[in-house]
């Protein structure tokens, strides 16, 4: 038997307009930097790729997703030290033999010039100047992202 | 006097970081259901556990973290079909030989009665009635969560 709260929440959710997304971030939280319509968190500590993904997720954010070369360059401009690497949300899918973003889309080969191998247990990091394939177990920094403003009419694809 | 939820919320609530709070969801987005102070998204499609974690992350949410038996029961009440399994944010840490939430806290052994083995590549799913250990590569549905409102002065021990 469903409680009254549970019953209500189902009905309410079904009656709401699909454009009523989360209110969205109006400003970036402390420690996060704004880059266009995103808030980015550049970690100081280090983690393997999986832990980095989990950390962003528990912060209700995503490992960085990069749309194109332009966004890559702007992100790299925020990295102060040449020697530092940061995980992003891209790893090698063995079953699909391709680089895959954590949102399920494949890498457009023109977007990033990756240094290193495309093979099992490879994940992608960025530095101030380059994009590297690294073993996913390597402990390096990571970048989380939050969307700064709600994108109207964005419907989360059926998960 | 603290409610049972407040009393039992120690580790799980300490997953997020108080300095990374968005202004908070006032209402749950379309397709998400409200359960107390959370918004839950029950997927319709299926995925291995890792992909489910990634999917929640790209939705700026987390695989479900369950505070206590009470929250488990209320979540299970929202599952309509007895035969369906859903991944939650709990898997077996081989290095630590323990069940570990994706926020880094260990499972309180009293919270969930798990059917199945605690071993490498085991992840936790819930059904309408039970909690199961499954191979993480199994493709089943999953549950994402977003905090509905920021709870001020909450100490989040993780980005």
């Amino acid at each position: 038997q469903k409680s009254s709260i549970e019953k209500c929440s189902v009905d309410i959710q079904q009656s709401r307009n699909k454009t009523t997304e989360r209110p969205g971030l109006l400003n970036c939280p402390i420690y996060w930097q704004q880059l266009r319509e995103k808030c980015l968190l550049f970690s100081h500590t280090v983690n393997p790729w999986n832990n980095s993904l989990a950390d962003c997720s528990t912060k209700e954010s995503s490992l960085l997703l990069i749309r194109d070369k332009d966004e890559l360059i702007h992100t790299q401009n925020l990295i102060r030290d040449k020697a530092i690497l940061f995980w992003i949300g891209l790893n090698f899918s063995l079953s699909e033999k391709n680089w895959k973003w954590i949102n399920g889309s494949f890498l457009n080969s023109n977007d990033l010039e990756i240094r290193g191998d495309a093979k099992e247990n490879s994940c992608i990091s960025i530095s101030q100047t380059s994009v590297y394939s690294e073993y996913c177990s390597t402990e390096i920094r990571w970048i989380c992202q939050k969307e700064l403003t709600p994108v109207r009419n964005k419907v989360y694809p059926d998960s | 006097q603290k409610s049972s939820i407040e009393k039992c919320s120690v580790d799980i609530q300490q997953s997020r970081n108080k300095t990374t709070e968005r202004p908070g969801l006032l209402n749950c987005p379309i397709y998400w259901q409200q359960l107390r102070e959370k918004c839950l998204l029950f997927s319709h499609t299926v995925n291995p556990w890792n992909n489910s974690l990634a999917d929640c992350s790209t939705k700026e949410s987390s695989l479900l973290l369950i505070r206590d038996k009470d929250e488990l029961i209320h979540t299970q009440n929202l599952i309509r079909d007895k035969a369906i399994l859903f991944w939650i944010g709990l898997n077996f840490s081989l290095s630590e030989k323990n069940w570990k939430w994706i926020n880094g806290s260990f499972l309180n052994s009293n919270d969930l009665e798990i059917r199945g083995d605690a071993k490498e590549n085991s992840c936790i799913s819930i059904s309408q009635t039970s909690v199961y250990s499954e191979y993480c590569s199994t493709e089943i549905r999953w549950i994402c969560q977003k905090e509905l409102t920021p709870v001020r002065n909450k100490v989040y021990p993780d980005s």
């Epitope: 420690y31 100081h44 500590t45 280090v46 832990n51 950390d55 402990e139 | 300490q14 880094g104 100490v155």
Partner: antibody, heavy 121, light 107 residues
Framework: EVQLLESGGGLVQPGGSLRLSCAAS????????MSWVRQAPGKGLEWVSA????????YYADSVKGRFTISRDNSKNTLYLQMNSLRAEDTAVYYC??????????????WGRGTLVTVSS | DIQLTQSPSSVSASVGDRVTITCRAS??????LAWYQQKPGKAPKLLIY???SLQDGVPSRFSGSGSGTDFTLTISSLQPEDFATYYC?????????FGGGTKVEIK
Amino acid sequence: EVQLLESGGGLVQPGGSLRLSCAASGFAFSTYAMSWVRQAPGKGLEWVSAISGVGGTTYYADSVKGRFTISRDNSKNTLYLQMNSLRAEDTAVYYCAKPLDSSLWADFDLWGRGTLVTVSS
Amino acid sequence: DIQLTQSPSSVSASVGDRVTITCRASQGISSWLAWYQQKPGKAPKLLIYYASSLQDGVPSRFSGSGSGTDFTLTISSLQPEDFATYYCQQASVLPITFGGGTKVEIK
């Protein structure tokens, strides 16, 4: 209860060794980098060492490099500091400390009570 | 290593006074500066992080400001429980470094 509790301090002769422990509770220990910070009697605070959450990455102050080793056992929620070749100038209260955010090394929002290490002949 | 220079090293003040402590970094650290309060025989307590963010439970009479190399901790109206030593700390790069401390004493 969210807390850190150090142990293992005591009196040791110069050149000797000591192992400090810090038991953590009430928070997701393995997601945080952890540090040791010390304070000599009547002096200021000095950061000693830090370790990543997974434990594979460590850093040391120059003053202890090669002599001290930081480690952690996440299954026991415990942080350690192995101190070898101790010198008189290592005499201090040693604190373990947790950062405010899992993405940081510092901004310590939780400290232990400290354990006193005295190096003297 | 980044050096942090605190001034003054000690200050005598009365209850109700406004007290200002400064911390200067040897190189730019953006907003990566924290302030701690320490009382004799006790562990330090975080007051301010990221230059100006007040830690939970810390009275609003404490405030922080600054960025780059120059930072300030202000106690707007000194209370009896505020007599203690205050330290700044940078979290920009490893090694983590602390200022030498400022002792706030009763006049």
